[in-house]
Interface confidence: low
């Protein structure tokens, strides 16, 4: 599929001008290559009319130009003094005409309306309001006032001053007669439809002395604004319909076959399942304008979108609308990353978030999408040292691995953590990505004690048991704070006895705190990583209390002489597992999709990439009791 994008249809009137914008991926090659506008012939060729290399066909001499905007990835073709001969099929493209790096554009130039003398032209947008003014003379002041519409050869009564209203206009038309001082009556038509367009005749009086006035009503369907965004990226539709519909329900819909427009989201609480977790309808302003943000763009999101206002929250005849044509560029600069990450309850997940690598110094954020009302995304953590209070001790945003990716680790998972999360930065707004966290059944991997109490001035040793599947991973202990997790020295105590069917490759790694102080109180994590790519973590809260008796504390999972198959793992410890990144292959960004054959083995990763049919529940706030 060609990554070039432009308007599918351009309509204009004889004598007018058009401006046609074509979009291309702004790679360095594309920025400097030839741009062209050509007309398609009956036998398939395409004859160049104008190009960026200075060529202008004699047909376009003195009335057309082509301007490249390499920084935006666009070029614009302006054509003036249009005639009906200009109607036809064209291509805008890059390189050579036959190469296929192009987009088809249909240009239709119509004749200007043939108007009667003394005809007032009203040009109004679809869904809006028109006021047709009709002057009359004093002798007709007391006589019947009427408005007719010319249908074919015959005038059809639309409204009159005796109370008649044509059924096609019921509920959206009125006839106002001005005060005695002004010899004028007005007909106001609301919620204009395309079918309202045409020639009208105002009349005051019914005899040969009646006053008549011709009006031509042109109802404009909005030209779609072209929007060109990257696959996996984000788009924002800004919808400003005007203060007259400030209190009417708003919607964004996507046109499917024919005239159907399927609601994507509306202010009445409807949201299409395909957009769950990746859409926000930003609150309306007083003037009725609003915006809709969609993240995690997919190929199938491409198409024509309309925003509008109607009490039903969906497109109806006469809704005022705004239109966009969204093109999703598959030659995306946004790297693939898992769209679904699975973790076991009590476990952890490590989420990789892409960002624009040119903006390494930007602030990174992670927020939780909430579907209530029209969607919102309250922040949970940032790279500047802020963590939402309810997430203290179990959430960390790390700048690693860097170079276009940051990591978010969330541990102590519960079913309430299932839901959609957004990765954001304060830089390029197109790089908003979405990940769904799913909580699944399973056995935990890392084993740590429950919350631990240390004694002031004494030594505390906290164990972390790593199964053999992590034998090739780096094992670490760190102390959590709101800027990350600071690494601490730890001791490998040899094989662990905490696992059944696990050989000498299992490991018991201890954290030792000597001469405990009040400053040692807090959350500690043990975890695994490979280089700058993080895997599973487990968290322990260490409380510090006054000395009661001399000696050191050695916290173990259970009594040391327990047989491997004994059920000693009770409420005094926590088992934590992360199914998100366990297979070392997953640490390579480009290999985010584990082979499905790996899924049968519990030791393998469970990461989905691409769109997911399943939807997770929404998350709530989480509270710790320290």
């Amino acid at each position: 599929k060609s990554p070039i994008f432009g308007p599918e249809e351009v309509n204009s009137v004889e004598g007018n001008s058009v401006s046609i914008t074509c979009y291309y991926p702004p790679t360095s090659v594309n920025r400097h290559t030839r741009k062209y506008w050509c007309r398609q012939g009956a036998r398939g060729g395409c004859i160049t009319l104008i190009s960026s290399e200075g060529y202008v066909s004699s047909k376009y001499a003195g009335r057309a130009n082509l301007t490249n905007f390499p920084e935006n990835g666009t070029f614009v073709v302006n054509i003036a003094q249009l005639s009906q001969d200009d109607s036809g099929r064209y291509k805008c493209g890059l390189g050579i005409n036959s190469r296929g790096l192009s987009f088809d554009v249909s240009l239709e130039v119509s004749q200007g309306p043939g108007l009667l003398n003394d005809t007032k032209v009203y040009t109004v947008d679809l869904g809006r309001t028109v006021t047709i003014n009709c002057p009359f003379k004093t002798e007709n002041a007391q006589k019947r006032k009427s408005l007719y519409k010319q249908i074919g050869l015959y005038p059809v009564l639309v409204i009159d001053s005796s109370g008649y209203v044509n059924p096609n206009y019921t509920g959206r038309i009125r006839l106002d007669i001005q005060g005695t001082g002004q010899l004028l009556f007005s007909v106001v038509i609301n919620q204009l439809r395309l079918s309202d367009a045409g020639q009208y005749l105002c009349q005051a009086g019914d005899d040969s002395n009646s006053n008549k006035k011709n009006a031509d009503l042109q109802v404009l369907k909005p030209e779609p604004e072209l929007v060109y965004e990257d696959l996996r990226g984000s788009v924002t539709f800004h919808c400003a319909l005007g203060p007259e519909v400030a209190n009417v329900a708003k919607f964004l819909c996507r046109q499917s076959s024919g005239e159907n427009c399927d609601v994507v989201v509306n202010t009445l609480g409807k949201r299409a399942p395909a957009f769950e977790g990746r859409i926000l309808l930003n609150p309306q302003d007083k003037d009725g304008s609003f915006s809709v943000v969609i993240t995690g763009l997919r190929k199938e999101d491409a198409g024509r979108y309309l925003c509008g206002a109607h009490s039903d929250g969906q497109l109806q005849e006469g809704s005022p609308i705004q239109a966009w044509q969204l093109f999703v560029n598959e030659e995306s600069t946004i790297p693939r990353s898992p769209t679904v990450v699975k973790g076991v309850a009590g476990s952890s997940v490590a989420v990789l978030c892409p960002y624009n690598r040119k903006e390494s110094k930007s602030i990174k954020y992670w927020c939780l999408w909430e579907g209530a009302q029209n969607g919102r995304c309250p922040l949970l953590v940032d790279s500047e040292g802020w963590v939402k209070a309810q997430y203290e001790g179990r959430l960390s945003l790390l700048e690693e691995p860097g170079n276009g990716t940051f990591t978010v680790i969330l541990n102590q998972l519960t079913s309430r953590d299932a839901g959609f999360y957004w990765c954001l930065t304060n830089g390029d707004t197109l790089w908003r990505t979405t990940v769904e966290i799913k909580i699944i059944e399973g056995e935990p991997n890392l084993k740590v004690p429950g919350n631990v109490t240390a004694v002031l001035g004494e030594t505390l040793k906290v164990p972390c048991h790593f199964p053999c599947k992590f034998s090739s991973y780096e094992k670490y202990w760190c102390k959590w704070n709101n800027t990350g997790c600071q690494a601490l020295p730890s001791q490998d105590e040899g094989p662990s006895k905490a696992f059944v069917n696990c050989d000498e490759n299992s490991r018991l790694v201890s954290l030792t705190l000597n001469l405990v102080t009040r400053a040692d109180e807090g959350w500690y994590w043990c975890g695994v990583k490979q280089g700058h790519f993080y895997g599973e973590t487990a968290a322990v809260y260490v409380a510090v209390e006054e000395r009661k008796a001399a000696g050191s504390r050695d916290v173990s999972l259970a009594k040391a002489d327990a047989a491997p198959d004994e059920k000693v793992l009770d409420s005094g410890f926590r088992e934590i597992e992360n199914k998100a990144i366990q297979d070392p292959r997953l640490f390579a960004e480009e290999k985010a999709v584990a082979d499905t054959r790996d899924q049968a083995d519990g030791s393998r990763a469970s990461v989905d990439s691409g769109s997911s049919e399943e939807q997770g529940g929404s998350s709530r706030h989480h509270h710790h009791h320290h």
């Epitope: 930003n282 602030i363 954020y365 909430e370 309250p378 922040l379 940032d382 802020w386 209070a389």
Partner: nanobody, 125 residues
């Protein structure tokens, strides 16, 4: 670069109301991507947080002493953020500053990227 300009300050009697407005402008401003906040600084005191509203208007936060009296709102179409102040007290006398943070606001912690010049509010008893 984002420029913030406050307006609406002035002299008001205790118990009265004022509405402050902050207009944001900038060459590449995507106003709906900024969290917005109001801070104030009384003579001889440190600048303190007043209220904030998040990037998509989903949440508002207020300093405890201003809850119920002050209301923050935003109009993304006009690139403005407003602060409605009711039941004003002499203690509310200060220079009020508008602040912006890309994507940001959460509780009373607000790491502003941009600041306005401030507008003086004086509450007389």
């Amino acid at each position: 670069q984002v420029q913030l300009v406050e307006s609406g300050g002035g002299l008001v009697q205790a118990g009265g109301s004022l509405r402050l407005s902050c207009a944001a402008s900038g060459r590449s401003l995507g106003f709906d991507t900024y969290g917005m906040a109001w801070f104030r600084q009384a003579p001889g005191k440190e600048r303190e947080f007043v209220a904030s509203i998040d990037w998509n208007g989903g949440s508002t936060y207020y300093a405890d002493s201003m809850k119920g009296r002050f209301t923050i709102s935003r109009d993304n179409a006009k690139n403005t953020v407003n602060l409605r102040m009711n039941s004003l007290k002499p203690d509310d006398t200060a220079v009020y500053y508008c602040a912006a943070a890309r994507y940001y606001t959460s509780s009373t912690y607000f790491p502003a990227n941009y600041w306005g010049q401030g507008t003086q509010v004086t509450v007389s008893s």
